[in-house]
């Protein structure tokens, strides 16, 4: 027997405005930096890639997804120390023998010039100047992203 | 030399209101279900645990984190079919030989009674009635969560 709270929950908010616009961030939270239409969080602590992915997720954000070379350069310009590496949301898919973004898309070979091997347990990091393949177990910093503006029709239905 | 856009970005929005309240969802997106102060997304499709984590992340949400037995029971009450399993944000940390939530905390042994082995490549799923350890590579459904209300002082400093 479901309690009234579950009954309310199962009804997928029929009474609310069924707009497909989700609230979205109007400005970036403290400690996050705005870069165009994104908010970026550059970690100070270090983690393996998997933990970095999980950390961004628990912050209701994503490991950084980079659309093109231009966005890469602008992101790298925000890195203040040449020696620091940051995980982004790209790793090697062994089954598909290709670099794969965490949103399921594959790397366009023109987008990033990767230094290092494309092999099992390889994940991608960026520095102020370069893009590197590293063992995913390496503990380095990472970059989370949130979309800044309300996104129309980015519905996120049920999964 | 930084362009004006980067200068603006590096300045972490000094001019904006420095509240530690981030916008938060005021109501749940379409297809998501409200359960207390969370929006839950019960997937219909299936994925390995890692892909489920990534999917929630790209939705700027998290695989489900369960605080206590009470929240587990209320979540299970929303599952409509006894035979369906859903990934949550808990897996086995080989290095720490313990169940670990994706937010970095360890499972309190009193919270969930897990059926199955605690070993490498084990991830946690829930059904309408139980909590199971499964191979993380198994393709099952998953549950994403978003916090519903604005959360004061949840600052997300650097990580």
């Amino acid at each position: 027997q479901k309690s009234s709270i579950e009954k309310c929950s199962v009804d997928i908010q029929q009474s609310r405005n069924k707009t497909t616009e989700r609230p979205g961030l109007l400005n970036c939270p403290i400690y996050w930096q705005q870069l165009r239409e994104k908010c970026l969080l550059f970690s100070h602590t270090v983690n393996p890639w998997n933990n970095s992915l999980a950390d961004c997720s628990t912050k209701e954000s994503s490991l950084l997804l980079i659309r093109d070379k231009d966005e890469l350069i602008h992101t790298q310009n925000l890195i203040r120390d040449k020696a620091i590496l940051f995980w982004i949301g790209l790793n090697f898919s062994l089954s598909e023998k290709n670099w794969k973004w965490i949103n399921g898309s594959f790397l366009n070979s023109n987008d990033l010039e990767i230094r290092g091997d494309a092999k099992e347990n390889s994940c991608i990091s960026i520095s102020q100047t370069s893009v590197y393949s590293e063992y995913c177990s390496t503990e380095i910093r990472w970059i989370c992203q949130k979309e800044l503006t309300p996104v129309r029709n980015k519905v996120y239905p049920d999964s | 030399q930084k362009s004006s856009i980067e200068k603006c970005s590096v300045d972490i929005q000094q001019s904006r209101n420095k509240t530690t309240e981030r916008p938060g969802l005021l109501n749940c997106p379409i297809y998501w279900q409200q359960l207390r102060e969370k929006c839950l997304l019960f997937s219909h499709t299936v994925n390995p645990w890692n892909n489920s984590l990534a999917d929630c992340s790209t939705k700027e949400s998290s695989l489900l984190l369960i605080r206590d037995k009470d929240e587990l029971i209320h979540t299970q009450n929303l599952i409509r079919d006894k035979a369906i399993l859903f990934w949550i944000g808990l897996n086995f940390s080989l290095s720490e030989k313990n169940w670990k939530w994706i937010n970095g905390s360890f499972l309190n042994s009193n919270d969930l009674e897990i059926r199955g082995d605690a070993k490498e490549n084990s991830c946690i799923s829930i059904s309408q009635t139980s909590v199971y350890s499964e191979y993380c590579s198994t393709e099952i459904r998953w549950i994403c969560q978003k916090e519903l209300t604005p959360v004061r002082n949840k600052v997300y400093p650097d990580s």
Partner: antibody, heavy 121, light 107 residues
Framework: EVQLLESGGGLVQPGGSLRLSCAAS????????MSWVRQAPGKGLEWVSA????????YYADSVKGRFTISRDNSKNTLYLQMNSLRAEDTAVYYC??????????????WGRGTLVTVSS | DIQLTQSPSSVSASVGDRVTITCRAS??????LAWYQQKPGKAPKLLIY???SLQSGVPSRFSGSGSGTDFTLTINSLQPEDFATYYC?????????FGGGTKVEIK
Amino acid sequence: EVQLLESGGGLVQPGGSLRLSCAASGFTFGQYAMSWVRQAPGKGLEWVSAISAAGGTTYYADSVKGRFTISRDNSKNTLYLQMNSLRAEDTAVYYCAKPLDSSQWADFDLWGRGTLVTVSS
Amino acid sequence: DIQLTQSPSSVSASVGDRVTITCRASQGISSWLAWYQQKPGKAPKLLIYAASSLQSGVPSRFSGSGSGTDFTLTINSLQPEDFATYYCQQAWVLPITFGGGTKVEIK
């Protein structure tokens, strides 16, 4: 441009085989479960098969179970339908379709133009 | 399998009319219903999902309602481009099923 493009249809004799392909572009193909839907001449829509984003889980309509096999190659952004033991009642336009959200099977917001399969002696 | 029964199977209407199509599910499907429009020789087009949510780019004269087993698609002020066949589809459980279709014809 966001699109799906089917190919591989044609005329085949009963008992024969065909392999349909669907090339995806403009979206993150590997994030989505995908389906095949068919439409017999002058008839309604019938869901045929679905495959999970990672490709490890497949489902079929009873009418094609054991004869059709759905598969995908995420590195090539391509969906396939291998059709064996074809029957006259399999004659239809076959569409590949993408769901609105990565965690949905249905609510198809993107369809291909379709490819016609004719099973006749 | 969940059966979806659409009615009417066809309707004759004029430009400016209000048209209502219903879809009944053989068992409860919560709000997991979508509506599609299909024109001859073309692929279907998603109009409404989650029973009442309007898909991006679809004119606001289209609306959906209902929950459980009974659902409705309404076209307010029918336009010339709206003459087509409309299908409902449930996404509650596999196999995905479609209604038999409703043809909206010019009176």
